[in-house]
């Protein structure tokens, strides 16, 4: 007996050929012999089956010898070992239909978990072996569960349901809710002005919710609320703002902030949160703010940052294309009677300059000069 | 709804080989037959053959000896190429799905063939 | 190959008139016929198949009826968005063949 394996809501041919490469009369039974089609010359007959609505052939090919079943939008239940009568023979053929299907909402928060439920007919035994995005590969039974999400697990799951030596093959889209980077470090020099982006790692239709900045500054003994805004079909509207600092807020995705001056005061780490409407639990997104400070005073040259630094990070005083005069991992460094001439204060990692200030230091009769 | 998006090189020379794809989207794949049909001023609708999921092809016997058609079930698609064209090939080709009626099309790729 | 002919090639009508347009094929095709409509620019669309039955989403105005070798699509009361050119195509045996279409223009 010939096993086809079909998909839940798919279309499946199941084929019955005769030795006679005309149009001649054939019947499709099911397993209590109920007609579902046949024909009557050329005309195609249907029985009183239940997939009277959902059964079809191809008149095309009768003149072939082939007298095919194509049954639309599979059912669980259309399961069953389906007879061809053709030239006083009978060929069997068992369709076993499954269905995959993810167990919740496809759109995921970062860090939840997946569940996939295979429905199939009863009797079968079939295994199912699924690949991520990234190559991870999960087998199970009846349900596959994948914890922890990353964002590396958006995109085309593809699931192979194993019955009888035959495969079926299911795609199932998966996005995995996050912003694009789980961190990330803003260098600024004191008085810019301060860009805070945070991408989306994923593009819906509608996106509703509300968000909310947490600001944790380095000279602060507890963390305050910066701002809360809602998100209404991809608008941003403001709900509340501190009055200092007088965070703006963009319209428009991707969430961006702007902080007027970069200051000491406000150097430190923040923790945007997102809640979006029908979802438990909130994407979040760190993002710190390192700030720098280059000062004179009498003869005492200076350079101090504030904020969360790496301690493999070098700040260093130098006077314009010369030798480092100072270099420390520290988070100040100064210079005693500097000599004239544009001093550069640097932050820097392994080599790369991440922040830089440059100071004009005049001879000792005048006032230093802060470009 | 089952979407269909097709390409393919829009201006050819005499003698060269057209070739088109198709992408199915949003539907089952298995089970249809996934056709190509041109339309020219000239000759109205043509249809030129079909393929199925297995690979099993029906053409026109009128274009038989320069049409291929074939099918990547990794990615839902399916191709035509028509060898040695001529000027008389000229005309907006369509993909379409089929089982007995053409119930989904996709949305037309002119092609021109000129020296 | 089964050869359809389409009549009239154009008719010119007003809204709210009741049209008739006939296809013909060389041989009995039983009832493997289908009727499309097609609007400038864009593909054929499916109105009718197995001679009568309607695709879903198509208005109740239009009808087909006809067997063997006779065919026939009835729009009951023209709407201004109904004139565009129609196709009958058979689906008895390869090829399939189409209808030369009649174009339905506003008188």
């Known amino acids: 007996k010939k096993v086809v394996l079909g998909k839940k809501g798919d279309t499946v041919e199941l084929t019955c050929t005769a030795s006679q490469k005309k149009s001649i009369q054939f019947h499709w039974k099911n397993s209590n012999q109920i007609k579902i089609l046949g024909n009557q010359g050329s005309f195609l007959t249907k029985g009183p089956s239940k997939l009277n609505d959902r059964a079809d052939s191809r008149r095309s090919l009768w003149d072939q010898g082939n007298f095919p079943l194509i049954i639309k939008n599979l059912k669980i239940e259309d399961s069953d070992t389906y007879i061809c009568e053709v030239e006083d023979q009978k060929e069997e053929v068992q369709l076993l239909v499954f269905g995959l299907t993810a167990n919740s909402d496809t759109h995921l928060l970062q860090g939840q978990s997946l569940t996939l439920t295979l429905e199939s007919p009863p009797g079968s035994s079939p295994s199912v072996q699924c690949r991520s995005p990234r190559g991870k590969n999960i087998q199970g039974g009846k349900t596959l569960s994948v914890s922890q999400l990353e964002l590396q697990d958006s995109g085309t799951w593809t699931c192979t349901v194993l019955q009888n030596q035959k495969k079926v093959e299911f795609k199932i889209d998966i996005v995995v809710l996050a912003f694009q980077k789980a961190s990330s470090i803003v260098y600024k020099k004191e008085g810019e002005q301060v860009e805070f982006s945070f991408p989306l790692a994923f593009t819906v239709e509608k996106l509703t919710g509300s968000g909310e900045l947490w600001w944790q500054a380095e000279r602060a003994s507890s963390s305050k609320s910066w701002i809360t805004f809602d998100l209404k079909n991809k608008e941003v509207s403001v709900k509340r703002v501190t009055q200092d600092p007088k965070l703006q807020m963009g319209k428009k995705l991707p969430l961006h902030l702007t902080l007027p001056q970069a200051l000491p005061q406000y150097a430190g780490s923040g923790n945007l949160t997102l809640a979006l409407e029908a979802k438990t639990g909130k994407l979040h997104q760190e993002v710190n703010l390192v700030v720098m400070r280059a000062t004179q005073l009498q003869k005492n040259l200076t350079c101090e940052v504030w904020g969360p630094t790496s301690p493999k990070l070098m700040l260093s005083l130098k006077l314009e294309n010369k030798e480092a005069k100072v270099s420390k991992r520290e988070k100040a460094v100064w210079v005693l009677n500097p000599e004239a001439g544009m001093w550069q204060c640097l932050l820097s990692d392994s080599g790369q300059v991440l922040l830089e200030s440059n100071i004009k230091v005049l001879p000792t009769w005048s006032t230093p000069v802060q470009p | 709804q089952v979407q269909l998006q097709q390409w393919g090189a829009g201006l050819l020379k005499p003698s060269e080989t057209l070739s088109l794809t198709c992408a199915v989207y949003g539907g089952s794949f298995s089970g249809y037959y996934w056709s190509w049909i041109r339309q020219s001023p000239g000759k109205g609708l043509e249809w030129i053959g079909e393929?199925?999921?297995?690979?099993?092809?029906n053409y026109n016997p009128s274009l038989k000896s320069r049409v291929t058609i074939s099918v990547d079930t990794s990615k839902d698609q399916f191709s035509l190429k028509l060898s040695s064209v001529t000027a008389a090939d000229t005309a907006v080709y369509y993909c379409?799905?089929?089982?007995?009626?053409?119930?989904?099309w996709g949305q037309g790729s002119l092609v021109t063939v000129s020296s | 190959d089964i050869q359809m002919t389409q009549s009239p090639s154009s008719v010119s009508a007003s809204v709210g008139d009741r049209v008739t347009i006939t296809c013909r094929a060389s041989?009995?095709?039983?009832?493997?016929l289908a009727w499309y409509q097609q609007k400038p620019g864009n593909a054929p669309k499916l109105l009718i198949y197995d001679a009568s039955s309607f695709q879903s989403g198509v208005p109740s105005r239009f009808s087909g009826s006809g067997s063997g070798t006779d065919f026939t699509l009835t729009i009951s009361s023209l709407q201004t968005e109904d004139f565009a050119t129609y196709y009958c195509?058979?689906?008895?045996?390869?090829?399939?063949?189409f209808g030369q279409g009649t174009k339905l223009e506003i008188k």
């Open positions: 195509q058979q689906a008895n045996s390869f090829p399939y063949t």
């Open positions: 041989q009995g095709i039983s009832s493997w």
């Open positions: 379409a799905r089929v089982i007995n009626w053409f119930d989904s």
């Open positions: 393929i199925n999921q297995s690979g099993s092809t």
